[in-house]
């Protein structure tokens, strides 16, 4: 069965900094990735940032720079501009539509005992949905 | 079939604004990102901006921050482009373009003339 | 910003003929997470609001005939028309696809003899 994994990670220099990890582990090929916050795509969440393989990525603030880290995975690098922190008690959502397997998404947040500059471990997956 | 019908040509005085439309039918909306695009006459493509329609946070093309303004409306499926300001320079067809650049609206050509 | 630069600006070739157009990128549109080049092509034709025509850099949009060809990595990329035929009489755009702000080609305007 395909499985979604979500890593969240806050910068050890900048507080206000994360970044979003994710990638799909199965057998299909990626056709567009979707991240959103505050719940999933489509069920109250806030789209942050498109990528498709071959069309490029596009995000939107408070996302900085989504990319591609691998065929299967990507990351999304957050800046919190307000004084104080949200991003760490936020959920991240991220949908991997793929072929010929449907759509699977998980989310994850920043652990709350998560030293700066730590990855967190795999998050559980909360939400695994195929649509 | 996909379609985005934009609003009609305006002429418009030096100095106004003008609030452009784009009518989205055929998709679901709030799944796909608007882009906003100028293309002068006989000239090339300018990108002008992109917004989505479940984030207040559009991204600008430095160039047209503070001449440009992206919102949309879910309830009618209709993204705007309001642009103030205006001079000869922003005379040109504007179009909207949903996704990737995949599918164009079928442009607003505005005049900018006293 | 990434500056693309088309060439030759205009060209004339007649119907059946094999015609080729460069895109030259200021900065590399590769990204070396998935090894693609997020570079497109589009087609105007008079009139017309431009069409998707080719995408990371040689896959074509669904309904493109096959005679338009994208290849090329990095800075340097190139559009063929196999055999061109009447209906191409358009000008031809490559976009940066890589990184904001999009940015475009100034065009080659293709005509036929």
């Known amino acids: 069965t395909p499985e979604v994994w979500v890593q969240v990670q806050m910068e050890a220099t900048e507080l206000s900094s994360f970044t979003v990890h994710c990638g799909f582990l199965g057998p299909g090929s990626i056709s567009l990735v979707t991240v959103s916050w505050g719940g999933p795509d489509g069920a109250g969440g806030t789209k942050l940032a498109v990528l498709h393989p071959e069309l490029g990525t596009r995000q939107w603030a408070p996302a900085r720079q989504a990319r591609w880290e691998t065929q299967s995975s990507i990351s999304l690098a957050l800046e919190d501009s307000g004084a104080s922190s949200p991003f760490a008690n936020t959920t991240f959502c991220c949908k991997f539509a793929s072929f010929p397997e449907g759509s699977w998404e998980s989310c994850g947040s920043l652990p709350p005992s998560s030293d700066p500059g730590l990855s967190a471990p795999p998050t559980p997956v909360p939400i695994l949905r195929a649509d | 079939e996909v379609q985005l019908q934009q609003s009609g040509p305006e002429l418009v005085k030096p100095g106004a604004s003008v609030k452009i439309s784009c009518k989205a039918s055929?998709?679901?909306?709030?799944?796909?990102?608007m882009n906003w695009v100028k293309q002068s006459h006989g000239k090339s493509l300018e990108w002008i901006g992109d917004?989505?329609?479940?984030?207040?946070?559009?991204n600008y093309n430095q160039k047209f921050k503070g001449k440009a303004t992206l919102t949309v409306d879910k309830s009618s499926n209709t993204a705007y482009m309001e642009l103030r300001s205006l001079t000869s320079e922003d005379s040109a067809v504007y179009y909207c373009?949903?996704?990737?650049?995949?599918?164009w609206g079928t442009g607003t050509t505005v005049t900018v003339s006293s | 910003d990434i500056v693309m630069t088309q060439s030759p600006s205009s060209l004339s070739v007649s119907a059946g003929e094999k015609v080729t157009m460069s895109c030259k990128s200021s900065?590399?549109?590769?990204?070396?997470?998935?090894?693609?080049?997020?570079l497109a092509w589009y087609q105007q034709k008079p009139g017309q609001p431009p069409k998707l025509l080719i995408y990371?850099?040689?896959t074509r949009e669904s309904g493109v005939p096959d005679r338009f060809t994208g290849s090329g990595s990095g800075t340097d990329f190139t559009l063929t028309i196999s055999s061109v035929q009447a209906e191409d009489l358009a000008v031809y755009y490559c976009?940066?696809?890589?990184?904001?702000?999009?940015?475009f080609g100034g065009g080659t305007k293709l005509e036929i003899k």
């Open positions: 373009a949903s996704g990737y650049f995949d599918v």
């Open positions: 055929g998709y679901t909306f709030t799944d796909y990102f």
């Open positions: 917004i989505i329609p479940n984030n207040d946070s559009p």
């Open positions: 900065q590399s549109l590769l990204n070396s997470g998935n090894q693609k080049n997020f």
């Open positions: 990371g850099t040689s």
């Open positions: 976009q940066n696809d890589h990184s904001y702000p999009w940015t």
